[in-house]
């Protein structure tokens, strides 16, 4: 019996009946054994077939076998009801070997030419299976030359049998207070050869409740308890199960905060598995009763471990723990069934006693001493000498606990001194220097510090003066002795003020003319305004209309009088404004350098002389009456003039204050 080629030789070739293409002889028996490599099969087909036809091919035949299985017994030329001829059929071995047997009996009625066949080894596609047969692989089958391999979907691992996919279903930990878990692929059939472990792990104090839902189908056995597939539930105190079959297990109240669920499957079966909905419970906390004027959120039927509530107060009420305020309040239920914080109160907002208003007073409108939410108070300034700035003085206790003005301001109103008040009424005519009476020049300030000078009170903590008068003290402001509220230069009865800082105009150059001869002194304390101490007003934009040529201004001071001594009593003089060109011309001739009079200066005095300010008056105010507001304002600052005060054809020169309003305002607002 000839053997066909064996692997690793190339496996292909031709087979033919003895004597082919001539007729075959009687009593012949020929056997071929073909062997292909592992993972390969043999394919065989006939190009010629002509054998004696007999019932069930008993006489002459070709038999194809693979292992113990006969693939075909062939005879004749064409197939009949009971006999088979190969025709165009292709035959395949079942494994890697194929046996071909040819036999002829003792006689032939006529000559038959036999057969010719060709064979070859080809790869087996193990991944293709006949309908109804079990698939080669659980999930994915991959064919290759000489073999195949299986692989698994994500979440699965190939079992050591190399075909089954076991679920990767262990190590899942559920920490939420409720949830769902199920067998892998539920409600589709669960995987074979798997061992699943699920953990529910809640905070201490919780108790897990398990409910089996929808359907339950785990392989079972009529006599033995769950021998194939089973579900077990384990807590720190007891074990439940094993469970299998088709009946939904009852609810399990574990009384434990940790649960382990184990699900084991074998290699066979087709069952849909299980689904568990778990919840948890804990010892409830006492129901929170909202404090008066407050409410609880969220509202729940009960509050258990980890549940929380917040308290919100009605508008105008605030959270308080005793005397201590809280912005928010949230309490959390603890495992022992108590809240972690005590309930606060919602107390009516109390803005407290309003702050005192400097130079003003406060009146309770709602009721004596009432300072709670929506209470109203009224601030007012001391009449005559103070006026309220910007504000109407009405404040309401708002929900944030602050007294708030109608404009939404939380700061106190400001009582600003009324400026430009004087006891003096002016006559239109010019007359000689006179003694001032009380209240005539309440802005007048006496400045002592090396020399005698003057200034004018602005607001209640600034003094306007000439730069040359305080230049020497610019770095030692505290050396300035500032007195106000008195008429007599040497009187012990005056209001003392001290300087905090001196601001000299940056454009002023000492001993090089008097341009920009202006300075501000900041007092270290506010002075109390009264009939003898009142600030002078700064000029309005429209003030120039009251300072035209020949308009009368008033200068006051303790400077040199005609007798050549400093005045004991405050003196004043009413003098007209002089045309600027006329004044400029008066100071163009020697000994005065050209350009002595600048646009930042104004001149006042009589052509005939005799009325003037003099040394010791420096820094004092030249004031004018604003007939619209009926307030006095500072138009000039006593700056310089001829060596001989009151000289005919010469005039007093004053710093023109209206040119310096931005400078004054900037310094006062910045400091």
């Amino acid at each position: 019996t000839p053997l066909g080629p064996k692997w690793p030789e190339p496996v292909f070739g031709r087979l033919a009946s003895p004597g082919f293409p001539g007729e075959y002889a009687n009593d012949q028996e020929r056997r071929w054994t073909l062997t292909a490599p592992p993972g390969y099969r043999l394919r065989l087909y006939f190009t010629h077939f002509d054998l004696e036809l007999s019932h069930l091919c008993e006489y002459d035949f070709v038999k194809l076998s693979s292992g113990a299985k006969v693939l075909a017994t062939l005879c004749g030329q064409e197939s009949t009801d009971t006999e088979r001829a190969p025709g165009k059929d292709t035959f395949y071995s079942l494994g890697s070997s194929l046996d071909i047997t040819f036999r002829s009996d003792y006689s032939n009625e006529k000559p038959f030419t036999g057969f010719e066949a060709f064979y070859a080894a080809e790869d087996i596609d193990e991944c293709q299976v006949a309908p109804g047969e079990a698939p080669t692989c659980d999930h994915h089958c991959h064919n290759h030359l000489g073999g195949f391999y299986c692989s698994c979907r994500a979440g699965y691992v190939l079992h050591r049998n190399k075909r089954t996919c076991s679920a990767l279903c262990s190590g899942q930990v559920f920490t939420q207070r409720s949830g769902e878990l199920s067998s892998p692929e539920y409600p589709r059939p669960y995987p074979k050869l798997s061992s699943c472990t699920y953990s529910i792990s809640l905070e201490e104090g919780f108790s897990v409740i398990l409910d089996f839902v929808e359907s339950f189908d785990v392989e079972t056995h009529p006599e033995t308890l769950c021998p194939y597939d089973f579900l077990k539930i384990q807590t720190d105190r007891e074990e439940h199960g094993p469970f299998c079959g088709k009946t939904l297990p009852h609810r399990i109240e574990t009384k434990s905060n940790t649960v382990t669920i184990t699900f084991v499957t074998d290699e066979s079966g087709d069952h849909t598995g299980w689904k568990i909905h778990y919840t948890s419970t804990a010892q409830p906390c006492p129901y929170p009763m909202a404090p008066p004027n407050g409410h609880v959120s969220p509202v729940q039927a009960k509050y258990i471990l980890k549940d929380s509530f917040s308290i919100f107060c009605e508008t105008g009420y605030e959270l308080l723990q005793g005397h201590l305020p809280l912005k928010s309040f949230t309490a959390v239920c603890q495992k022992d069934g108590s809240w972690d914080r005590p309930m606060p109160a919602c107390s009516i907002v109390d803005c407290g006693p309003p702050d005192d208003l400097p130079s003003g007073r406060v009146e309770y409108i709602t009721g004596p001493g009432v300072t709670t939410y929506k209470a109203v108070i009224q601030y007012s300034c001391e009449e005559t000498f103070y006026t309220m700035k910007v504000n109407d003085g009405k404040y309401v206790c708002e929900a944030d606990g602050f007294w708030t003005s109608s404009k939404g301001e939380k700061s106190l109103p400001v009582c600003e001194p009324v400026c430009g008040l004087s006891a003096r009424t002016t006559g239109g005519r010019i007359y000689g220097g006179q003694k001032a009476k009380p209240g005539d020049f309440p802005w007048q300030v006496l400045i002592l510090g090396g020399t005698t000078a003057a200034g004018a009170l602005l607001y209640d903590n600034w003094v306007l003066t000439a730069a040359h008068a305080v230049y020497e003290q610019k770095h030692d402001a505290s050396a300035l002795d500032i007195r106000m509220g008195t008429l007599k230069r040497l009187s012990p009865h005056y209001t003392q003020a001290w300087s905090e800082a001196v601001f000299i105009h940056e454009g002023y150059t000492h001993d090089a003319g008097f341009d920009n001869d202006i300075a501000l002194i900041k007092l270290n304390n506010k002075v109390v305004i009264n009939s003898n101490i009142t600030p002078i007003c700064l000029p309005r934009k429209e003030a120039e209309s009251f300072m035209r040529t020949d308009d009368i201004g008033t200068a006051s001071g303790w400077g040199l009088t005609q007798r050549g001594f400093l005045a004991r009593n405050l003196m004043y003089v009413d003098i007209p404004i002089v045309d600027h060109q006329k004044c400029t011309a008066a100071y163009e001739k020697p000994p005065y350098p050209r350009g002595s009079v600048t646009a930042n200066m104004l001149c006042a005095g009589l052509e005939s002389g005799g009325k003037d300010s003099c040394r010791g008056d420096s820094g004092g105010a030249l004031v004018f009456l604003d007939s619209e507001t009926e307030r006095w304002f500072v138009g000039g600052i006593v700056s310089w003039g001829s060596m001989n005060c009151g000289e005919a054809g010469q005039y007093g020169v004053y710093t023109k204050v209206i040119n310096y309003i931005p400078w004054i305002e900037n310094i006062i607002s910045d400091f």
Partner: antibody, heavy 114, light 107 residues
Framework: QVQLQESGPGLVKPSETLSLTCTVS?????????WNWIRQPPGKKLEWMGY???????SYNPSLKSRITISRDTSKNQFSLKLSSVTAADTAVYYC???????WGQGTLVTVSS | DIVMTQSPATLSVSPGERATLSCKAS??????VAWYQQKPGQSPRALIY???YRYSGIPARFSGSGSGTEFTLTISSLQSEDFAVYFC?????????FGGGTKVEIK
């Protein structure tokens, strides 16, 4: 971790103003709570001076009301104490604390002496 | 002002024993009372708030009780680190006030 730290001069002259600052880290002073100043004279009990709340409102011990000011700088997460016209009786360890004392500063000794 | 009176001024206890500290308020303060522990040279350490609520991190041997005007701090089993001065504090009304302290010393 919430931390409070007092800072300021350890020596103040009589009649002058005592100034201390409490710097808070780990929690915003505008988020919630009252922020207190408390002092403890040597060998004596604790004395609450006043607080400034998360909203900026203040509450003072009436015995100090005319001399005390508590303010805050929210940009620096600090609150401050000013106590004017001090005398030797104001010598103490000064603490800042939160609300009803869950967190305290380490304290700073202020001596009033000429 | 609400006066907080602590008694006794000094308490001598052996380690492992129970210590009971009392604090009386001169008027009703609800449960708005806190307890502090203070050791020499250190700032106070908060133990209890709202009369009976223990701060996190405070050992369970410390417990507080009471309401209205009478309050108690109990240390169930004194440890060596518990020997210190203990203050009660009311925050119910302005001005907030403190007790004079109870010194717990080793017997």
């Amino acid at each position: 971790q919430v931390q409070l730290q007092e800072s300021g001069p350890g020596l103040v002259k009589p009649s002058e103003t005592l100034s201390l600052t409490c710097t808070v880290s780990g929690y915003s002073i505008t988020s919630d709570y009252a922020w207190n100043w408390i002092r403890q004279p040597p060998g004596k009990k604790l004395e609450w001076m006043g607080y400034i709340s998360y909203s900026g409102r203040t509450s003072y011990n009436p015995s100090l009301k005319s001399r005390i000011t508590i303010s805050r700088d929210t940009s620096k997460n600090q609150f401050s104490l000013k106590l004017s016209s001090v005398t030797a009786a104001d010598t103490a360890v000064y603490y800042c604390s939160r609300h009803y004392g869950d967190y305290w500063g380490q304290g700073t000794l202020v001596t009033v002496s000429s | 002002d609400i006066v907080m009176t602590q008694s006794p001024a000094t308490l001598s206890v052996s380690p492992g024993e129970r210590a009971t500290l009392s604090c009386k308020a001169s008027q009703n303060v609800g449960t708005n009372v806190a307890w502090y522990q203070q050791k020499p040279g250190q700032s106070p350490r908060a133990l209890i708030y709202s009369a009976s609520y223990r701060y996190s991190g405070i050992p369970a041997r410390f417990s507080g009780s009471g309401s209205g005007t009478e309050f108690t701090l109990t240390i169930s089993s004194l440890q060596s680190e518990d020997f210190a001065v203990y203050f009660c504090h009311q925050y119910n009304a302005n001005p907030l006030t403190f007790g004079g302290g109870t010194k717990v010393e080793i017997k």
